[in-house]
Each structure stands twice: as structure tokens, then as C-alpha cells.
């Protein structure tokens, strides 16, 4: 028949070439002279003549060895023609199987893989997976089977096997205990991968395991006792640096220092920070420490790590005692702003009040008294007693030196100490009105026309306060009652004032006499203009001219 | 050489409590891997939990999944095992092992634990 | 149901050879040579006997052997003795939370 079964051609083969491989017959041959060819990859295109076919015999043949890992498999077809050229028979499919030879090594796939593993952990932990690769048959044959293995580890510490290897998968994993980072930061492992499932040919890589820190080891103050010296009232003042080691990563939240102050700041007088490159503890005052209250405190501070411990570990903790140093404080006012009511206008030399002030110090210190700011002039401090008395006229109707009924004063007072300190206090005397104002009128100056005048309405102002103000009372004096009435409003706070006689266009005084409730008088001229004109008028019109 | 030894073990009520401590000499204790292994009247062993050599890791079962807590102190050569919330099935020698570099285990005598009314 | 598969019994004769097998798969005893065998006797502690296949410790006497093909590994008791009449117990390392896994154990009695 005119069929050929697949032929299994072993790669590498060393000949002698031609090969003869297998004979392609056709029973046809019988009746007439047949002729042999074959076509296809191999044979007549690419890769031409790897195979050939002696014409008249029918014999396939191989003309070189083959590369399973380049073509695993050839698919031609025999021909069979007639004398005349004729087919004699439809193309044969002929299967050339190259079946394969250990020829090559397993490859890893990197000289060096790298992987990590957390410090501490459990046998059993995943580290990573190394991959080698065999060009050879691995489906029908072991050659390409490959088996992984671990060479050698470098440093042996604590065991010699820290880490072992899948055979199949490639996936290194931890099988001792022990894994420091403190002590082995690094592993180097030399790995095979050997084909023929682990019996043939081998080739070695790299793996570098590196470990990764766990916070096992908790931070320890050294020195773990400590004395300082601050001075009292100093606030935000560096009272001392605390010196942690921790032997974990260094700027890793497993060694970056966090400090409590576990006890002896009753009075939350200091905080704590830590440097962010030297990881020390900075201690400073939150509020000013009294040497007079408390001149000694013993602090305790316990130091941990801004990650949480893995594992139990004991917190260390220092101890600082901190000395207060005296300083000369300066007098304080007691109160530090003083409030005192005063009448205006009392006389030269009267006592306003004693403003003094206490020093913090423990010692029998003189204090003076001065004052430091006095805009008006008004004031005198005695410098012993600190009694403040009047020297000038206190108005409360100032209102250059007076707001809203207050005197401002600054008053200072001096110790003795070396060197002496000074502190300040603040007086503000409320100054109590009385009635040493009479009312005015506004405006004072006014036009009037001289035929069917208008009422002229003046505003009654008086600098007093209530009840030395409105209502007003108002009287014409010195004859002007001839010429003018004047009238206060029923609110009190306004006078009209009229013209009731005829007067020729001049200007004229109104001599006006106002009182207040508290009967204060005030007598005012009022410039009146009266103009030749009827009603209501602004200015006087000029001189009327006929045509 | 490993000498491990057990102590601890007792009779106790259901939903009682024990602690067991396991004492080690003749090795870096701080190296190994430790392992608390039971083993049930009449059969097999069972392996209750282990901790890593710095304590940093454990593991357990899920027969006895956050009820056993294991724990070490390096600075004693001491493992523990924390047994809180006992049952019936709880009843077993305890064995301390340690877990060694060639991966086998290291054990010792054992301490009896007996939950029962 | 355990990890590893063990016979329940074998048993033999005084000077015959026996075998008790510790069947796992690819990604236990497979994967690694790090099948342990241990000893133990009534109501005492298990002993190991060979580590890491076929390594025996000192003190342990050289008729035990261990081999391993595949996923199964052997140990092999030569000149049969009343004294090795015990339970044994394999185990095997293997990747993962529960690094150690143990068979169920085979009950050996010396006829």
C-alpha cells in the first residue's frame, strides 16, 4: 500500500549521511517503471534538504542531523509518477518525528534572584521562586525535567539550612528558625537546577535573601539617668536630650523613637519630642517652672517605637532630674490692671489710690514705684509707697487724653536685685463727671430775614454727662428780650430763637443765657444777620436796583 | 544536648484554664522554632502551635484557634502554652519540641492534661 | 484524616526485614528530603529515628534505614527485634502556616 507510518529520527544523530531512514513503495510499480519524490518543508522549501529521496528506489533520506529544539517535527509528502510523468498514485503524508536528546542544560532565567523575608517568622514562610528553564523535552522524557536544589548558604549563621527549596516549583522557603536581621541581614544561596528530574546535567545561580526588620528589639536610653538645670519661668527652654539605641533599622519606623512622660509632671510643666535624624528625646518646658513653688522635679520617661513591638519586649525608661534655677522675677501689680473711680476735677494733691506691686522672690526686696506713662500729666507715684495722687486737673471732658470716661496710666515698679527687674501695671481711672460744663448753643452764628421771619432753631450741646445735661432752660440778657424771643423745646435739647421787632438789615448780638438741669449757666453771643427780605433766607441779598 | 521538660499539666474543670511551661537546656533556645504537639489516650499527634525563635510569629490549629496562646521568654529558655476555655477533646499528653535545623523535632517527656467534671 | 498516609499495622517476625511507607504529595514529601521517622513506645515520648530522609542520629542503630521515591518515603527495619515494637510516626516538612505535617501513625508488632 501506498502509506508510510511515522518515522521517529533521533536528533543529533552522527550518520554517516545520507541516512537511509525508510523505502516509499507503490504496488504500481508492477506495471510500470515509478519514479519517487517528496515536497515540503525539509525537502524542497525551507528548510531545503534536510531530506531527500533516491528517485528510482524510493529510499528516504536524511542528509544532516537534526534539532528537535529547532523543528520537533516534519510533515512531507511522496510523490509517484509515471515513465510519462503521470501520478501514479495522490501524495503520501510521510511524519518525520525528531525525538529528543539530552542536548542542553537547564538555564535560569537571572544569574541573581532577590527576595526578602521578614525577620523572625515561622518555618514554613514563602520567600520567593526562582525559574530555570530547559529547552528539552520535558512532556515524553526527563530532559527537560528540572529538579532545584540548594547549593550552599552564606553565612551559615544560625544553622547551615535556613532555607530550602521546592523541586518542582522553584519556590525557596524558610525551614530553620532564627532568621536575625540584627545578627544576618543578608543570605546568599548558591541554587542548582539539574535537568533529568535531578539526574543529569546542572547549572547554579545566585539567590540573595535579604531580611527584613521586624521591630523585635525595642529602643534603650543610654545614658538611663540624667540631671539638668533650668531656669525658673523659662518657657519652651531645652532642659535635656535623651540618648536612645535600638538595634533595629535605622530611620525605619522600627527605630524612630516615640517618649512618654510616665510620671513626675504633676503639673504638665514639660513635653517631649523626638529629633527626626538623631532620634533623640527633646525636653522642654511647656509652661515656666517656680523655683519658689518647687525647685526640684524628678522626671520618669518611657520610650517605645513608633511601629508596635512584635514580640514582648521590655520598655526602657530614664529618669531625669530636673533643678530649678532662681531668677530675679520682676514685681507684678497686683491687680496687673487696676480700675479706680475718681471725680474729675479734684484738687491738686488728693490721693487717687495705692497701686503697688508683690515680688515672686523669696527675699525682703525693695520695690520703688515710678510712672511710666501719664499723657495728661496729671498723676504723681510716691516711690515708696506706690500711692498715686493728682497733680494736675483730671477732666473727664479731655477727650484727648480720656476715652470713654478712662485714664489710661502705666505705672512701673522697680526691685533692687542684681540685676533688677521691672514689671508694669495698667491704672484706668474711671473719672466720675461733674456738672463744670454749661450748655451751648449751635450754631452761633445765624440769617434772619427782617419781614416774616423764620424761627431760628440752635442746638443746646453740653459736654456734662446725665444728670448734668437737658432739659435746658434759656433767657435773653442785656436787653436782647427787646428784640428776640427764646424758647427751650419740650424735649429740652433745642432753643428757638425769634425776631419779634422789625430791625434794619445789620448784625446784631443775642446775648443768650442757657442753664442745665443742674442749673450750670452759660451766657453766648449769637452773631445774627438780619437782611432786608421776606422768610427764609441763607445770605443777605445785595442792594435792589431799578431799571 | 536538647533536654526539654514540661510542667503544668492537671485536672481541670470544662471551661477551666491552664498554663503549661516547657524549661530548655542544651541548645540556643532563641534559634529554634518551638512546637506545642498533643497526643489524645489511644492516638496520633497532633500539633497544637508553634512560635517562632524570636516570638515574633505563631501559629495554631483551628481546633484550638483563640482559646491556646503560645508564648516564649527568650531570656528564661521557657515556652508556654496558654490554655483558656478547656473542653472534653482538650485531654492529652502535651509535648514540647523543638524544632531543629534538619527539620525534625526534638521532644519532651510530655505533661498530662485531664479536663473533666 | 491526616496529612500523611501511613498503614494503621505491620507486623514481622524477630529477624525478618520490614517496611512502613508515608504517602504524601508533590508539595510535602515530594518536594523536599525532609521526611522525619520517630519511635514511640507506650507511654513514653516519640523518638526521632532518621531525619532528613535517611540520616540517622547518633544512638540510633543502623537497622533502621529511610529511602524516598516520589511522594512516598520508606523506613526499613532489618533483623526484626522485640524492642521495635512501637508506634512510628513520619513527618514531612511542606510551604506554609502548618510547616510539619505528621502521618497517622502505624502500630509495628514484632510476632
Known amino acids: 500500500d501506498w502509506v508510510v507510518a511515522p518515522i521517529s529520527v533521533p536528533e543529533n544523530g552522527k550518520g554517516p549521511f545520507p541516512q537511509r531512514l525508510n523505502q516509499l513503495k507503490s504496488n504500481k510499480d508492477r506495471d510500470t517503471k515509478i519514479f519517487y519524490s517528496i515536497t515540503g518543508p525539509g525537502a524542497d522549501s525551507p528548510p531545503e534538504g534536510v531530506f531527500a529521496v533516491e528517485k528510482e528506489t524510493g529510499w528516504l533520506l536524511l542528509n544532516k542531523p537534526l534539532d528537535r529544539e529547532e523543528i520537533a517535527k516534519y510533515e512531507l509528502f511522496g510523490h509517484a509518477v509515471s515513465e510519462n510523468g503521470a501520478s501514479v498514485e495522490d501524495p503520501m503524508n510521510i511524519s518525520i518525528i525528531v525525538t529528543d536528546q539530552n542536548d542542553h542544560k537547564p538555564k535560569f532565567t537571572q544569574d541573581t534572584f532577590r527576595g526578602s523575608v521578614l525577620e523572625g517568622v515561622l518555618p514554613g514562610t514563602s520567600v520567593m521562586q526562582v525559574t530555570a528553564t530547559d529547552e528539552d523535552d520535558a512532556i515524553y522524557t526527563y530532559n527537560g525535567v528540572v529538579a532545584y536544589s540548594i547549593h550552599s548558604q552564606e553565612p551559615k549563621d544560625p544553622h547551615d539550612l535556613m532555607f530550602t527549596i521546592h523541586r518542582s516549583t522553584g519556590t525557596i522557603s524558610v525551614i530553620s528558625s532564627g532568621l536575625d536581621r540584627e545578627k544576618v541581614p543578608e543570605y546568599t544561596l548558591t541554587i542548582q537546577a539539574t535537568d533529568m528530574d535531578g539526574d543529569g546535567s546542572t547549572t547554579t545561580a545566585v539567590a540573595v535573601v535579604e531580611i527584613l526588620d521586624a521591630n523585635d528589639n525595642a529602643p534603650m536610653f543610654d545614658p538611663q539617668k540624667y540631671e539638668a538645670h533650668v531656669p525658673e519661668n523659662a518657657v519652651g527652654h531645652e532642659v535635656q536630650r535623651l540618648t536612645v539605641t535600638d538595634l533595629d533599622a535605622p530611620n525605619s519606623p522600627a527605630w524612630r523613637a516615640t517618649y512618654l512622660i510616665m510620671g513626675g509632671d504633676d503639673g504638665d510643666h514639660f513635653t517631649i519630642t523626638t529629633h527626626p535624624e538623631s532620634n533623640q528625646g527633646i525636653l522642654t518646658t511647656r509652661k515656666g517652672l517656680d523655683f519658689e513653688a518647687k525647685n526640684q522635679h524628678t522626671l520618669y520617661v518611657e520610650v517605645t517605637n513608633e511601629a508596635p513591638f512584635v514580640l514582648k519586649l521590655p520598655t526602657s525608661t530614664a529618669t531625669i532630674v530636673v533643678h530649678v534655677e532662681d531668677v530675679n522675677e520682676a514685681p507684678v501689680f497686683v491687680p496687673p490692671s487696676k480700675v479706680v473711680e475718681v471725680q474729675e476735677g479734684i484738687p491738686t494733691g488728693e490721693p487717687v489710690c495705692v497701686y503697688t506691686a508683690e515680688d515672686p522672690d523669696k527675699e525682703n526686696q525693695k520695690i520703688s514705684y515710678r510712672i511710666l506713662r501719664d499723657p495728661a500729666g496729671w498723676l504723681a507715684m510716691d516711690p515708696d509707697s506706690g500711692q498715686v495722687t493728682a497733680v494736675g486737673t483730671l477732666d473727664r471732658e479731655d477727650e484727648q487724653f480720656v476715652r470713654n470716661n478712662i485714664y489710661e496710666v502705666m505705672v512701673l515698679a522697680m526691685d533692687n536685685g542684681s540685676p533688677p527687674t521691672t514689671g508694669t501695671g495698667t491704672l484706668l481711672l474711671t473719672l466720675i463727671d461733674v456738672n463744670d460744663h454749661g450748655p451751648v448753643p449751635e450754631p452761633r452764628q445765624i440769617t434772619i430775614c427782617n419781614q416774616s421771619p423764620v424761627r431760628q432753631v440752635l442746638n443746646i450741646t453740653d459736654k456734662d454727662l446725665s444728670p448734668h445735661t437737658s432739659p435746658f432752660q434759656a433767657q435773653l440778657t442785656d436787653d436782647s428780650d427787646i428784640y428776640w424771643t427764646a424758647e427751650v423745646n419740650e424735649e429740652g435739647d433745642t432753643v428757638v430763637l425769634s425776631l419779634k421787632k422789625f430791625l434794619k438789615q445789620d448784625t446784631y448780638d443775642v446775648h443768650l443765657s442757657l442753664s442745665d438741669h443742674g442749673n450750670k449757666e452759660q451766657l453766648t453771643v449769637i452773631r445774627a444777620t438780619v437782611c432786608d427780605c421776606h422768610g427764609h433766607v441763607e445770605t443777605c441779598p445785595g442792594p435792589w436796583k431799578g431799571g | 544536648e536538647v533536654q526539654l521538660l514540661e510542667s503544668g499539666g492537671g485536672l481541670v474543670q470544662p471551661g477551666g484554664s491552664l498554663r503549661l511551661s516547657c524549661a530548655a537546656s542544651?541548645?540556643?533556645?532563641?534559634?529554634?522554632?518551638m512546637s506545642w504537639v498533643r497526643q489524645a489516650p489511644g492516638k496520633g499527634l497532633e500539633w497544637v502551635s508553634a512560635i517562632s525563635g524570636s516570638g515574633g510569629s505563631t501559629y495554631y490549629a483551628d481546633s484550638v484557634k483563640g482559646r491556646f496562646t503560645i508564648s516564649r521568654d527568650n531570656s528564661k529558655n521557657t515556652l508556654y502554652l496558654q490554655m483558656n476555655s478547656l473542653r472534653a477533646e482538650d485531654t492529652a499528653v502535651y509535648y514540647c519540641a523543638s524544632w531543629g535545623p534538619t527539620a525534625s523535632l526534638d521532644w519532651g517527656q510530655g505533661t498530662m492534661v485531664t479536663v473533666s467534671s | 484524616q491526616s496529612a500523611l498516609t501511613q498503614p494503621a499495622s505491620v507486623s514481622g517476625s524477630p529477624g525478618q526485614s520490614i517496611t512502613i511507607s508515608c504517602t504524601g504529595t508533590s508539595n510535602d514529601v515530594g518536594a523536599y528530603n525532609y521526611v522525619s521517622w520517630y519511635q514511640q513506645h507506650p507511654g513514653k515520648a516519640p523518638k526521632l529515628i532518621l531525619s532528613?530522609?535517611?540520616k540517622r542520629p547518633s544512638g540510633v542503630s543502623n537497622r533502621f534505614s529511610g529511602s524516598k521515591s516520589g511522594n512516598t518515603a520508606s523506613l526499613s527495619i532489618s533483623g526484626l527485634q522485640a524492642e521495635d515494637e512501637a508506634d512510628y510516626y513520619c513527618t514531612s516538612y511542606t510551604m506554609g502556616s502548618t510547616f510539619m505535617l505528621f502521618g497517622g501513625g502505624t502500630k509495628l508488632t514484632v510476632l
Open positions: 542544651g541548645f540556643t533556645f532563641s534559634s529554634y522554632a
Open positions: 532528613e530522609v535517611n
